[in-house]
């Protein structure tokens, strides 16, 4: 009788190929050499191993690399990445953006898992900052990525990376995050002309101070109400009726529909009734 730990006669794997998918778990354990697996990792992802079989392959790699996998193995993990724990990933040193992309591809379409969050954290820490290429990659896979970072983490984003940010990447950011991002965006886009500048800076304005809003009001930007409603209340309150009228342009009529909501409500209460009446919207201060 074949001992369970011994590879049955004729089943020793000379290479990683499709025939292995028909092996039972213990056969994979007994018949696949870990070093062979490591050198032929590029083949593993092309073979439709089941979730259970991947457990065995992971176990073999863990035994071969107890201190963490080398990047040559990591970049070819493919579906095997789904089996990794955050603890496993913390042992890795991932420096190549191509490796990061390959692993994110496996998780595509799913929420950001703890494994992915750990991988990204390791990668960004290894690079020292969130550069444009990395940010481009991460927001392509996870539009909400930027807003998942703390204000402290966002402070390491260089202004040059802001060019990679799309409006939808900021949808879930809170005011504290926009406070950090806005000055970087202002710096990044400073050489653009008025209308182009406004298009780029618009989604960051939730972090803008009063003086910048006053400056924008002088540029005929026609800010929409959705953007206005995301502005910091403390930044909006000092604006005069004339400044708000210039800032919103034809959209000023939308204030009526928002008069009970912040920051419009609080701003209205700060204005003189005579000034509000000049808008002709029936706003009551």
């Amino acid at each position: 009788e074949v001992e369970k730990t011994a590879c049955p006669s004729g089943k020793k794997a000379p290479e990683i190929d499709e025939s292995l998918i028909f092996y039972k778990k213990w056969e994979l354990e007994a018949c696949v050499d870990a070093a062979l697996l490591a050198t032929q990792m590029d083949r593993v992802n092309a073979i439709p191993f089941t979730y259970e079989q991947l457990d065995v392959l992971k176990h073999k790699l863990d035994e071969l690399y107890p201190q963490g996998y080398p990047e040559s193995v990591i970049q070819h993990l493919g579906y095997l990445f789904l089996k990794m724990s955050p603890e496993d990933i913390r042992k890795w040193n991932v420096t190549s953006l191509e490796t990061l992309k390959a692993l994110l591809e496996v998780n595509k379409g799913h929420e950001m898992s703890p494994q992915v969050a750990t991988l990204i954290d390791r990668f960004v820490k290894g690079r020292g900052q969130l550069d444009k290429d990395t940010l481009d990659t991460l927001t392509a896979f996870y539009p909400g990525y930027l807003c998942s970072l703390s204000p402290e983490e966002l402070s390491s984003v260089p202004p040059s990376s802001i060019w990679a940010v799309r409006p939808q990447d900021l949808d879930t950011c809170d005011p504290r995050q926009l406070d950090v991002l806005y000055p970087k965006a202002r710096l990044a886009f400073q050489n653009m002309n008025g209308s182009e500048y406004f298009v780029k800076i618009q989604s960051f304005l939730g972090g803008a101070p009063t003086e910048d809003l006053k400056a924008l009001s002088q540029q005929n930007v026609s800010m929409d109400l959705a953007t206005f409603m995301k502005l910091r209340t403390d930044a909006v309150l000092p604006l005069t009726v004339a400044e708000v009228q210039k800032l919103l342009g034809p959209h000023v009529e939308g204030l009526k529909a928002e008069e009970r909501h912040r920051p419009v409500r609080d701003w209205i209460l700060r204005q003189r009734q005579d000034d509000l009446d000049t808008l002709g919207l029936g706003l009551q201060g």
Partner: antibody
């Protein structure tokens, strides 16, 4: 020719247990996983679980944990399914199937009908 | 659990026609999908393994395709003996799960 011969129909009382058998011919069950699948009248197929007869390792669908027990006897080339605390919900045809490491089910038995009735 | 959805409960076809039965997985199951035929009063029979490979003895008018989440069993030149229920199965991750089945009805 590969064949999986299952035991005959069972009529059992609620609360009782039943043990179904599945004997393979023309192949050694140790070389395969042996699965059990449930099919209720006019309903789909449900995977109960499987055993690796080589070492007795089993895996069950959560729904059948505690209800089903799968065993195998390699000397008689037979896999077994025991169902406990039977209720009318357990009235169904139960199939055994053999499969390779992929988890696919390649060959099926003819099925055993279990009727739970007082 | 991974849900396998066969949206068509019944499909009507004529002898000689070509018919495609589809199955959608609730998550990526790569190519770990099998197709099974169950004729009235009989046990299921394996037709296709690993999404596109025909089992021994299965006529070549049966072909499987797909990967990830979308899978198709195509029967070209349908014969009267193909009247049956057809089920898909995912065996990428346990618990393994079957589609609800598609009954092929010959006009």
């Amino acid at each position: 020719e590969v064949q999986l011969q299952q035991s005959g129909a069972e009529l059992v009382k609620p609360g009782a247990s039943v043990k179904l058998s599945c004997t393979a011919s023309a192949f050694n069950i140790k070389d395969y996983y042996m699965h059990w699948v449930k099919q209720r009248t006019e309903q789909g197929l449900e995977w109960i679980g499987r055993i690796d007869p080589e070492d007795g390792e089993t895996k069950y669908a959560p729904k059948f944990q505690g209800k089903a027990t799968i065993t195998a006897d390699t000397s008689s080339n037979t896999a077994y399914l025991q169902l406990s605390s039977l209720t009318s919900e357990d009235t169904a045809v139960y199939y055994c199937a053999s499969g390779s490491g992929t988890g696919a089910m390649d060959y099926w038995g003819q099925g055993t009908s279990v009727t739970v009735s007082s | 659990d991974i849900v396998m959805t066969q949206s068509q409960k019944f499909m009507s076809t004529s002898v000689g026609d070509r018919v495609s039965i589809t199955c959608k997985a609730s998550q990526n199951v790569r190519t770990a999908v099998g197709w099974y035929q169950q004729k009235p009063g009989q046990s299921p029979k394996a037709l296709i393994y690993l999404a596109s490979n025909r089992h021994t003895g299965v006529p070549d008018r049966f072909t499987g395709s797909g990967s990830g989440t979308d899978f198709t069993l195509t029967i070209s030149n349908v014969q009267s003996e193909d009247l049956a229920d057809y089920f898909c199965l995912q065996h990428w991750n346990s618990p393994y799960t079957f589609g609800g089945g598609t009954k092929l009805v010959i006009k």
